[in-house]
């Protein structure tokens, strides 16, 4: 039961995390105009990975996409790549983990296969989370560097009375969404990996129990189940007889009217 709960919780946490990574990637507020000494502004600038926006105090907002690919900073391209890789891995991980869930039965899929799929999705979630955290951190580092550079050049070219004030940018909401979402995906992935260990049947899982079926006896001996480490099915471990004695986790793997096929 604990394994099922861990797997289910890992899946839900990862799902929330990946939804957050997608949201962060799409958000326009990766960097927002720093309002250092002026909390009220007539023109407010903010930028995302895909477009930059200007919101006037009148309420009018104008956004312009970055229609160039080669003209963009390499760091921005790298952040985009990391976030997209994170989303793709996360999406595949979600797909795999759906079939790996113990509460869902697909044909005669055995526990060892589910364990492998759970581990695979867990690793994918971990890498996805790390990609998102890395992407957001790279962008944050870029912002910090530019912030101090623009602070140093805050009042450049002051010819007499004329001042050219540079717009400084600080952390936008998307960065925090990205960090939290990446963290959740990472945690979800770790939970899936932990669940995988419990899912994979071990030698000590079963005591020798004698079963009687239609006039001749068949006995299960310890060592009948081994944890499979590869992908694909392990036919040696296939269960043929449905006896009355089952472990707590095994109860879930029998079809019922609530199962999805």
């Amino acid at each position: 039961m604990a394994v099922t709960a861990c797997q289910g919780l890992g899946f839900v946490v990862s799902l929330i995390g990946i939804a957050g990574i997608i949201a962060a990637t799409c958000m326009d507020q990766w960097s927002t105009q720093d309002l250092y000494n002026n909390p009220v502004t007539a023109v407010f600038n903010y930028q995302g990975l895909w477009r930059s926006c200007v919101r006037e105090s009148s309420g009018f907002t104008e956004c312009r996409g970055y229609f160039t690919l080669l003209g963009l900073p390499a760091m921005l391209q790298a952040v985009r790549a990391l976030m997209i890789v994170g989303i793709v891995l996360g999406a595949i991980g979600l797909l795999v983990s759906i079939f790996a869930l113990k509460c869902i039965r697909i044909g005669s899929m055995e526990d060892s296969a589910k364990a492998n799929m759970t581990l695979t999705s867990g690793i994918m979630f971990i890498v996805s989370g790390l990609c998102a955290i890395a992407g957001v951190s790279v962008f944050a580092n870029m912002l910090v560097t530019n912030f101090w550079m623009s602070t140093a050049n805050m009042y450049t070219g002051m010819g007499g009375m004329v001042q050219t004030v540079q717009t400084r940018y600080t952390f936008g909401a998307a960065l925090f969404v990205g960090w939290v979402a990446g963290g959740l995906t990472l945690i979800g992935g770790v939970m899936m990996c932990i669940a995988c260990r419990g899912l994979a049947p071990e030698e000590t899982n079963y005591k020798a129990v004698s079963y009687h079926a239609s006039g001749h006896s068949v006995a299960y001996k310890p060592g009948g189940f081994k944890a499979s480490t590869g992908f694909g099915s392990n036919t040696k471990n296939k269960k043929i007889y449905d006896g009355g004695a089952r472990t707590e986790d095994e109860v879930q793997s029998y079809p019922s009217k609530h199962d999805y096929v």
Partner: antibody, heavy 118, light 113 residues
């Protein structure tokens, strides 16, 4: 069409206060900032402040803080400016103006003349 | 506060002439985010409220005759009337709408001979 109708001229004594109104019609009153601008006789335009009727947020010109108080009544689509402790320096024409795209004052009221005299 | 300086304070021209008036700001009004200059021009005829002419330094408000043209960037701006008409008799104000407090220039009074 957008219209801003201001209250009539006021003649007040020094030290008194006055409340000018600006009734808006032809647009969603709550969704646009309303500006107040004054013009002393023979002088230029001076921004007093603005109010967002949707939530009551205000921005003031530092020179008018304590002198002018901006309010708005969404139910009647009317913006108000209360001027206190009036002196002869406050004698001017006061305009209300809607804040539109490009941070512009795109529609103006006809103006309210306030004369402070004993 | 951003100080807006207009020149000349007044000018007299004959109908049909081309007119230019200047407006300088103490700080740049160019917003890097959208490369727009947050400067507005108004026309105020005697006994009337001001009327919006030009916004974003060069965008003509709908209904404004095309003889009115705004130009400039950063701190130096110009309003040009290509062929002055009798009805253009007014005071022209430039306005900073880039940062609070909103500030106006002192105005340029246009008179027709």
């Amino acid at each position: 069409q957008v219209q801003l109708q201001q209250s009539g001229a006021e003649l007040v004594k020094p030290g008194a206060s006055v409340k000018i109104s600006c009734k808006a019609s032809g647009y969603a009153f709550s969704n646009y900032w309303m500006n107040w601008v004054n013009q002393r006789p023979g002088k230029g335009l001076e921004w007093i402040g603005q109010i967002y009727p949707g939530n009551g947020n205000t921005n003031y010109n530092g020179g008018f803080k304590g002198k002018a108080t901006l309010t708005a009544d969404k139910s009647s689509s009317t913006a108000y400016m209360h001027l206190n402790s009036l002196t002869s320096e406050d004698s001017a024409v006061y305009f209300c103006a809607r804040w539109g795209t490009g941070n512009t004052m795109d529609y103006w009221g006809q103006g309210t003349s306030v004369t402070v005299s004993s | 506060d951003i100080v807006m300086t207009q020149s000349p304070s007044s000018l007299t021209v004959t109908a049909g002439e081309k007119v230019t008036m200047s407006c300088k700001s103490s700080q740049s009004l160019l917003n890097s985010g959208n490369q727009k200059n947050y400067l507005t021009w108004y026309q105020q005829k005697p006994g009337q409220p001001p009327k919006l002419l030009i916004y974003w330094a060069s965008t003509r408000e709908s209904g404004v005759p095309d003889r009115f043209t705004g130009s400039g960037s950063g701190t130096d701006f110009t309003l040009t009337i290509s062929s002055v008409q009798a009805e253009d008799l007014a005071v022209y104000y430039c306005q900073n709408v880039y940062s609070y407090p909103i500030t106006f220039g002192s105005g340029t009074k246009l008179e027709i001979k």
